[in-house]
């Protein structure tokens, strides 16, 4: 029957690499959107530019990076999309009014150590978590 | 000396509540932006609408939710911002051309169980991670 044929056809389109979401028939090819896909970009943050130079002793700044780009249907595997993002992308593709596209955000962040004066003028060396983008993905 | 006095005066302006990022003088008040702040919104995803009804047996759909809203300066503590997002917000506030605002994305996700036919027509019950948004934040 047409119904079962359609089902079998639908299933055959599902990705073989089904770790992220077995049920997402989201093609593993390049994004159809013209904007650049979600990825990590260069960003050097100068503590002086932030107005923090008077209490941060070191470093002078750091390579923070940032995430930007499209999370459009279909999502590629390198976009580190969560299962929810895969579903949201599909919902947006079917009806853009319903939900926005998922957003390009850090998926892995690293820490940096900062030497600074505290409010009592004591010198503190502290590790600040989640300061440097290591990888971006669609969330 | 004048230099150290100035430094000490500047330091006294840094925030007292410095859990998220000790060095961020990001005010704990409501966003100056007129758009609604980053938060969780309702979204019911019907597997039929996604074209998956022929191989997903159950459930018929699920409450997925989604994240949307502004991540503008200054970030409030309830926005679950990472240290990187706090820095990025400040960089954007100082120079909007440099980087975009951080984006509103899931910070906590839950799993759901799905019963479906695999490619060999076997019935599989599988727990899919990261399917339901539990909380949103600025990333």
């Amino acid at each position: 029957s047409t119904g079962s044929k359609q089902r079998s056809q639908n299933r055959s389109k599902t990705p073989k690499n089904q770790e992220a979401l077995r049920m997402a028939n989201v093609a593993e090819n390049s994004s159809s959107d013209q904007r650049q896909a979600c990825k990590k970009h260069e960003l050097y943050v100068s503590f002086r530019d932030l107005g923090w130079q008077d209490w941060i002793i070191a470093p002078e700044g750091y390579a923070a990076y940032y995430c930007e780009g499209e999370c459009a249907f279909p999502l590629n595997s390198y976009m580190n999309a969560t299962n929810h993002a895969i579903v949201q992308t599909l919902v947006h593709f079917i009806n853009p009014e319903t939900v926005p596209k998922p957003c390009c955000a850090p998926t892995q962040l690293n820490a940096i150590s900062v030497l600074y004066f505290d409010d009592s003028s004591n010198v503190i060396l502290k590790k600040y978590r989640n300061m440097v983008v290591r990888a971006c993905g669609c969330h | 000396s004048t230099g150290s006095k100035q430094r000490s005066q500047n330091r006294s302006k840094t925030p007292k509540n410095q859990e998220a990022l000790r060095m961020a003088n990001v005010a704990e008040n409501s966003s100056s932006d007129q758009r609604q702040a980053c938060k969780k919104h309702e979204l019911y995803v019907s597997f039929r609408d996604l074209g998956w009804q022929d191989w997903i047996i159950a459930p018929e759909g699920y409450a997925a939710y989604y994240c949307e809203g502004e991540c503008a300066f200054p970030l409030n503590s309830y926005m679950n911002a990472t240290n990187h997002a706090i820095v990025q917000t400040l960089v954007h506030f100082i120079n909007p051309e440099t980087v975009p605002k951080p984006c509103c994305a899931p910070t906590q996700l839950n799993a759901i169980s799905v019963l479906y036919f695999d490619d060999s027509s076997n019935v599989i019950l599988k727990k899919y991670r990261n399917m339901v948004v539990r909380a949103c934040g600025c990333h």
Epitope: S1, G3, S4, R7 | R48, Q53, D54, I57, A58, P59, E60, S113, V114, L115, F117, S120, S121, N122, V123, I124, L125
Partner: antibody, heavy 121, light 108 residues
Framework: QVQLQESGPGLVKPSETLSLTCTVS????????WSWIRQPPGKGLEWIGY???????RYNPPLKSRVTISVDTSKNQFSLKLSSVTAADTAVYYC???????????????WGQGTLVTVSS | EIVLTQSPGTLSLSPGERATLSCRAS???????LAWYQQKPGQAPRLLIY???SRATGIPDRFSGSGSGTDFTLTISRLEPEDFAVYYC?????????FGGGTKVEIK
């Protein structure tokens, strides 16, 4: 308590289309899978196919080219059409409900009382 | 498709005796997705067991199911006169859903 009742002609001519309807009472047809099963006289049970209330179907491969199952939620009914029948399609035809959740799936309960359809000229 | 073979074809026993019915699958039935039904002459089948071992609502506790993979068993601990009937196993772990050929439990 949910009850199922099959209805339709008891005699169908060879090469014609067998048409049966199952009326569901005591519960909504929504949120369940609804199935047809047949049993030739003195033989075992054969699953024909099912339909979900929203319209998605699955059929038994040997029969799928001849079978159509449809649903009418407004009447709380689902139907079976089996085309190009032969004497081998003579059987008692049962309708039954399949539970549909991640913890409840695949068994038939309850069943209709069945209706005998004879294929003969 | 998964082929279910039931044995014996006929089981002749007396009331009060223990009945052991076997259902063997041609390949493993995932998650023990197996059900048992009882059918009396002129009646529709009635669900006894689902999930290989869970009794359906209203089924007496003398009926029990066991097994996994390819070998399943329905046991009736003490046969009552109303238990003499045909019993079918059915798998729902793979499509198409299939039934065994049945075991007839008759009075000896």
């Amino acid at each position: 308590q949910v009850q199922l009742q099959e209805s339709g002609p008891g005699l169908v001519k060879p090469s014609e289309t067998l048409s049966l309807t199952c009326t569901v009472s005591g519960d909504s047809i929504s949120s369940y899978y609804w199935s047809w099963i047949r049993q030739p006289p003195g033989k075992g049970l054969e699953w024909i196919g099912y339909i979900y209330y929203s319209g998605s179907t699955r059929y038994n491969p040997p029969l799928k080219s001849r079978v159509t199952i449809s649903v009418d939620t407004s009447k709380n009914q689902f139907s079976l059409k089996l085309s190009s029948v032969t004497a081998a399609d003579t059987a008692v035809y049962y309708c039954a409900r399949i539970c549909s959740s991640t913890s409840c799936w695949g068994w038939f309960d309850p069943w209709g009382q069945g209706t005998l359809v004879t294929v003969s000229s | 498709e998964i082929v279910l073979t039931q044995s014996p074809g006929t089981l002749s026993l007396s009331p009060g005796e223990r009945a052991t019915l076997s259902c063997r699958a041609s390949q493993s039935v995932s998650s023990s997705y197996l059900a048992w039904y009882q059918q009396k002459p002129g009646q529709a089948p009635r669900l006894l067991i689902y999930g290989a071992s869970s009794r359906a609502t209203g089924i007496p506790d003398r009926f029990s199911g066991s097994g996994s993979g390819t070998d399943f068993t329905l046991t009736i601990s003490r046969l009552e006169p109303e238990d003499f009937a045909v019993y079918y196993c059915q798998q729902y772990g793979s499509s198409p859903l299939t039934f065994g050929g049945g075991t007839k439990v008759e009075i000896k």
